[in-house]
Amino acid sequence: KESCDVQLYIKRQSEHSILAGDPFELECPVKYCANRPHVTWCKLNGTTCVKLEDRQTSWKEEKNISFFILHFEPVLPNDNGSYRCSANFQSNLIESHSTTLYVTDVKSASERPSKDEMASRPWLLYRHHHHHHHHHH
């Protein structure tokens, strides 16, 4: 049953632990069939989600999936919080689950976790050459 509905693949209770001062890319995986939908990011403020205007975003196209990316260059302490992506497609609004960023302020962190430390803590997934990491419950 291959549906042509737009799908946003952000799982419920999705979380990322990141460090202030590092670059970070928040990805919204998008599946669409023909025309790429218009996708936006918003940040939750209580029950309302405030659209993020004037923020750097980009698309990354892969074979069976596309990613609408919100760039943090760099991560700031007040980037802490929950985000949601939304797609407008054929006058339908499709909303993702929220994904939460937990930002650790480097000033308050005693020391950045080393690669060895991360290897011993498998829930911290070290990605690329950046010093950010992900944390999934």
Epitope: K1, S3, D5, Q7, L8, Y9, K11, R12, Q13, S14, P29, K31, N64, I65, R84, L93, I94, E95, S96, H97, S98, H136
Partner: antibody, heavy 121, light 112 residues
Framework: QVTLKESGPTLVKPTQTLTLTCTFS??????????VSWIRQPPGKALEWLAH???????RFNPSLKSRLTITKDTSKNQVVLTMTNMDPVDTATYYC?????????????WGQGTLVTVSS | DVVMTQSPLSLPVTLGQPASISCKST???????????LNWFQQRPGQSPRSLIY???KLDSGVPDRFSGSGSGTDFTLKISRVEAEDVGVYYC?????????FGQGTKVEIK
């Protein structure tokens, strides 16, 4: 054509660890949106969701059993393995694996035939 | 945990007549993404469960259109417009909005 099949021991002793394998075909667990859940059904009783593994290896567990459960996937073999420690006679049930498809979130659209596991000394 | 309560637990029906099963949840199943993750499954005697309906009212592939689902919030209904002999079995509702995902206790449909 999507199929799932459970395999494992039919009889385990109390305190032993149960290991069940779900072998599937017709889909890939590396595809975005895909997942596999384990669900059990004691004889003559209702269904109980146990654990789920997503395409990106993220996992969810029923909190009432979380300390006893592990779930892993082998994408190349098209298999998902559930282990349950410290088995007890109350864990006697038919254990099913089901495909988690995605429409905004997971829903179970295909189920295996189930395997009856009896816990007895 | 969200408790799913089905009624009736046993439903004797006449062939060709309609049937209706209720499912109530202890919390609203409307998710923050605007969707309601309420599904219905059929389990025929001696068989595995089979998906009938997802997202309250979407019919799964291969499911006859005599089945329909409706409801919102905490109250949901599965309807069979004209019961056929192959519809005998146990029907379960399931919620996927809150972890842990939970099933109803089942409704046994049998022919009078």
């Amino acid at each position: 054509q999507v199929t799932l099949k459970e395999s494992g021991p039919t009889l385990v002793k109390p305190t032993q660890t149960l290991t069940l394998t779900c072998t599937f075909s017709g889909f890939s667990l590396s595809t975005f949106g895909m997942g596999v859940s384990w669900i059990r059904q004691p004889p003559g009783k209702a269904l109980e969701w146990l654990a789920h593994i997503y395409w990106d290896d993220d996992k969810r567990f029923n909190p009432s059993l979380k300390s006893r459960l592990t779930i892993t996937k082998d994408t190349s073999k098209n298999q998902v393995v559930l282990t349950m420690t410290n088995m007890d006679p109350v864990d006697t049930a038919t254990y099913y694996c089901a495909r988690g498809n995605w429409d905004g979130e997971t829903y179970f659209d295909y189920w295996g035939q189930g395997t009856l596991v009896t816990v007895s000394s | 945990d969200v408790v799913m309560t089905q009624s009736p637990l046993s439903l004797p029906v006449t062939l060709g007549q309609p049937a209706s099963i209720s499912c109530k949840s202890t919390q609203s199943l409307l998710d923050s993404d605007g969707k309601t993750y309420l599904n219905w499954f059929q389990q025929r005697p001696g068989q595995s469960p089979r998906s009938l309906i997802y997202l309250v009212s979407k019919l799964d592939s291969g499911v006859p259109d005599r089945f329909s689902g409706s409801g919102s919030g905490t109250d949901f209904t599965l309807k069979i417009s004209r019961v056929e002999a192959e519809d005998v079995g146990v029907y379960y509702c399931w919620q996927g909005t809150h972890f842990p995902w939970t099933f109803g206790q089942g409704t046994k449909v049998e022919i009078k």
